[in-house]
Interface confidence: medium
């Protein structure tokens, strides 16, 4: 742990580690019964993670603020960094125990050591994120999270260089979601699909999360998304609380980040 150059270090907030990854239903959070969670993992060539596998992943930085099914009907979630809104201020596996009612609805924690790894935590001042396999088409059943963590006081300017995801009403099939926060729970900015380049986005703080998800059928060309650091000195006049100036989307300052 600790700060270095104003950045909180350690590979926290990974969404996939040691073959363990978090899955939620396409309909959203906490929608999977035990049988459905098991089926989701198996469909992708994996299985429900054991408590030990989840703890091993947590030890190398796997942190998700969502309870999910594990093997043998257990429910819990891994916390690396304690926070007031997640994990009751504790670290470790927040364990709900083995559930008697297997029809309860939670997310899922899957284990698949052969799953394609993508995403991660990035502290560089600039970088380009690409969909897995770009410039080739991405695969079905992908889920990737890119977490950007810059120095306190800096902002993130996100721009879309290439963008071609499957078209589906409301982007229910394949999509990229952007969050103006450190996770995929708070600060939702938008969900994007299709082949139009979304407008640039400038964060309100020093963190941002990008999530890419593809479903089980039909793929497309993929994307390249670039971010650069906006230093406090060059923030220009961002008094405009909302909306769009040119092709840049300035986000209202609703979220404070450490």
């Amino acid at each position: 742990w600790g700060f270095k150059n104003g950045i909180f270090h350690n590979s926290i907030w990974l969404e996939q580690a040691a073959g363990v990854y978090h899955r939620e239903a396409r309909a959203g959070r906490y929608k999977l019964t035990y049988a459905e969670a098991k089926a989701v993992c198996e469909f992708e060539g994996g299985r429900l993670a054991t408590y030990k596998q989840l703890e091993a992943a947590r030890k190398i930085g796997f942190h998700v603020c969502a309870a999910g099914w594990m093997a043998k009907g257990r429910v819990g979630y891994p916390i690396v960094k304690p926070g007031p809104n997640c994990g009751f201020g504790k670290t470790g596996i927040i364990d709900y125990g083995i559930r008697l009612n297997r029809s309860e609805r939670w997310d899922a924690y899957c284990y698949n050591p052969h799953a394609k790894e993508c995403g991660g935590v990035f502290t560089d001042p600039k970088r380009i994120f690409k969909s897995p396999g770009f410039p080739n088409e991405y695969d079905d059943n992908q889920v990737c999270y890119w977490h950007i963590r810059l120095k306190y006081g800096q902002r993130i300017h996100l721009s879309f260089l290439d963008f071609d995801l499957e078209h589906d009403p409301g982007c229910l099939a394949d999509y990229v979601e952007i969050y103006d926060s450190y996770d995929d729970v708070h600060g939702f900015v938008g969900r994007y699909c299709g082949d139009e380049l979304p407008e640039d986005i400038i964060s309100t703080g020093n963190v941002m999360t990008l999530k890419f998800l593809s479903d089980a059928s039909v793929t497309a060309g993929g994307f390249q998304i670039k971010y650069v650091t906006v230093d406090p000195a060059s923030k220009s006049s961002q008094a405009k609380n909302t909306s769009t100036t040119g092709n840049k989307k300035f986000l209202p300052g609703r979220f404070s980040h450490l």
Epitope: H167, D168, P169, G170, C171, Y192, G194, D195, E196, S217
Partner: antibody, heavy 124, light 106 residues
Framework: EVKLVESGGGLVQPGGSLSLSCAAS????????MSWVRQPPGKALEWLGF??????????EYSASVKGRFTISRDNSQSILYLQMNALRAEDSATYYC???????????????WGTGTTVTVSS | QIVLTQSPAIMSASPGEKVTMTCSAS?????MHWYQQKSGTSPKRWIY???KLASGVPARFSGSGSGTSYSLTISSMEAEDAATYYC?????????FGSGTELEIK
């Protein structure tokens, strides 16, 4: 001419079931997402769900108000769209329209062709 | 879900008069679509992608707006324009319709 014609409406008791059909003609049915929309008497339109086209395996999505009670399916050999309605309630009384979903670039989906509608009344 | 509020609920206009109706979204949406429905008939696509007229729609109709505020305008009201107009979004799920603006001819 592109045409959608619904049938199967009528009077049904609360808790009962009904199946609506929508016969499509004038276009390649398998190439399109198809949807159901309803309109209670004197009220606004409400989207119920849609079913995807062949490339997406004909998977369906539903609105929260009907999920678990209504099922959308399609017979592609006959170009017919179905809406199976179970556990019907008084508030399900409405004119039911099938509509073709048209896509012309992200994120622009809209209902470009509408059927004539069929009326469902749920009452004891 | 995004709630679309149309105003006014009912309005009347004389032939030749300019008419504007609005559709306000509870959250920002990318585009708005509009449908025309005459009494006892099914809706018809009317304006899509905020401002594009569907085929067969007279040029006196126009659409505009962005974010949470959209409008449909008729530059010169004609008797055949009397109908109910519904706005609709699909920027986020589920797709939603407005409550409608009923336009009468004076």
């Amino acid at each position: 001419e592109v045409k959608l014609v619904e049938s199967g409406g009528g009077l049904v008791q609360p808790g009962g079931s009904l199946s609506l059909s929508c016969a499509a003609s004038g276009f390649t049915f398998t190439d399109y997402y198809m949807s159901w929309v309803r309109q209670p008497p004197g009220k606004a339109l409400e989207w119920l769900g849609f079913i995807r086209h062949k490339a997406k395996g004909y998977t369906a999505e539903y609105s929260a108000s009907v999920k678990g009670r209504f099922t959308i399916s399609r017979d592609n050999s006959q170009s017919i769209l179905y809406l199976q309605m179970n556990a019907l309630r008084a508030e399900d009384s409405a004119t039911y329209y099938c509509a073709r979903l048209y896509y012309y670039g992200s994120p622009h989906w809209y209902f470009d062709v509408w059927g004539t509608g069929t009326t469902v009344t749920v009452s004891s | 879900q995004i709630v679309l509020t149309q105003s006014p609920a009912i309005m009347s206009a004389s032939p030749g008069e300019k008419v504007t109706m609005t559709c306000s979204a509870s959250s920002s949406v990318s585009y708005m679509h509009w449908y025309q429905q005459k009494s006892g008939t099914s809706p018809k696509r009317w304006i899509y992608d905020t401002s594009k007229l569907a085929s067969g729609v007279p040029a006196r109709f126009s659409g505009s707006g962005s974010g949470t505020s959209y409008s449909l305008t008729i530059s010169s009201m004609e008797a055949e324009d009397a109908a109910t107009y519904y706005c609709q979004q699909w920027s986020s799920n589920p797709p939603t319709f407005g409550s409608g603006t009923e336009l009468e001819i004076k």
